[in-house]
């Protein structure tokens, strides 16, 4: 039965697969979910422990400085360009992240606290 299901699903023109999510901890055996139209599949997969140790995160980005505060949304943004990806991770080449603007005092405290982390 299991084979039939996989075979039937494979007739779908293009499956989109999510990341391999280990069942426990951050590596080892787990599951990956795939979708194709209305069809879904859940397959066993394995995150090699050496890869997780090497990277910790699937996608690493290098970020610009935060932009000016956008008064209309109350947020500021910055762009990140891909620095390194786990071999099988389908990472975006650029990403944009936003965060709420804070008052000057708050910003100063935050900057001191989070030095080197942004």
């Amino acid at each position: 039965k299991k084979k039939e299901k996989v075979k039937k699903g494979s007739e779908c023109s293009e499956w989109t697969w999510g990341p391999c999510t280990p069942s426990s901890k951050d590596c080892g055996m787990g599951f990956r979910e795939g979708t194709c139209g209305a069809q879904t599949q859940r397959v066993h997969c394995k995150v090699p422990c050496n890869w997780k140790k090497e990277f910790g995160a699937d996608c690493k980005y290098k970020f610009e400085s935060w932009g000016a505060c956008d008064g209309s949304t109350g947020t500021k943004a910055r762009q990140g360009t891909l620095k390194k990806a786990r071999y099988n991770a389908q990472c975006q080449e650029t990403i944009r992240v936003t965060k709420p603007c804070t008052s000057k005092t708050k910003s100063k405290t935050k900057a001191k606290k989070g030095k080197g982390k942004d």
Epitope: S10, W15, N50, L82, Y87, C91, E93
Partner: antibody, heavy 117, light 107 residues
């Protein structure tokens, strides 16, 4: 689009090391894994190893751990593969390829290395 | 290391026919399987990544299936330019490995 241009064919005597270069142009060189693959005459493809230009992290096929050294020069967007003490069985076409799981890969044109006395 | 076994070693077809190429992995590799085409004196060209994901610029007649241990590359209607050697490659674990290849030749 990434373009990879490899150095020209080499003829070496056994035991004389050889260094193949792979120069990238186009999209960011430093963001993607650079693979090295070889193909002996009339044979299939064999993976040598890979290096990530951002931090020079290298993963080598154990078969090549004492044979191949992978390096990168970020300033010139060039990857290198050096074969130490090559023997006649190392005669092959050596390819570099830049891998992105999202977009796929781009290959160099290949470099024929002939090891002969 | 993961061993990939390709079959058949040689496939003889006429243009217009359907081609089915198989690649079997020695253990489950999820969908971490890629297909390449190689013509004489050329570098390999990626056709399908991650078992079934299409590649920009590759004709729609090429499709792939998986995941698990049994994978297939299908060419719905073979064109004259498709006669070449086809390799599968796994990226599930080190070392990355290739299958021995299937030669698609004109009947």
């Amino acid at each position: 689009q990434v373009q990879l241009v490899q150095s020209g064919a080499e003829v070496k005597k056994p035991g004389h090391s050889v260094k193949v270069s792979c120069k990238a142009s186009g999209q960011s060189f430093s963001s993607y894994w650079m693979n090295w693959v070889r193909q002996a005459p009339g044979q299939g493809l064999e993976w040598i190893g890979m290096i990530h230009p951002s931090d020079s992290e290298t993963i080598l096929n154990q078969k090549f751990k004492d044979k191949a050294t992978l390096t990168v020069d970020i300033s010139t967007s060039t990857a290198y593969m050096e074969l130490s003490s090559p023997r006649s069985e190392d005669t092959a076409v050596y390819y570099c390829s830049s891998w992105s799981a999202k977009r796929g890969d781009f290959w160099g044109q290949g470099t024929l290395v002939t090891v002969s006395s | 290391e993961i061993v990939l076994t390709q079959s058949p070693a040689t496939l003889s077809l006429s243009p217009g026919e359907r081609a089915n190429l198989s690649c079997r992995a020695s253990e489950s590799i999820s969908n971490n399987l890629h297909w390449y085409q190689q013509k004489p004196h050329q570098a390999p060209r990626l056709l399908i990544k991650y078992a079934s994901q299409s590649i920009s610029g590759i004709p729609a007649r090429f499709s792939g299936s998986g995941p698990g241990t049994d994978f297939n590359l299908t060419i719905s209607s073979v064109e004259p330019e498709d006669f070449a050697v086809y390799y599968c490659q796994q990226s599930n674990s080190w070392p990355l490995t290739f299958g021995g290849g299937t030669k698609l030749e004109i009947k």
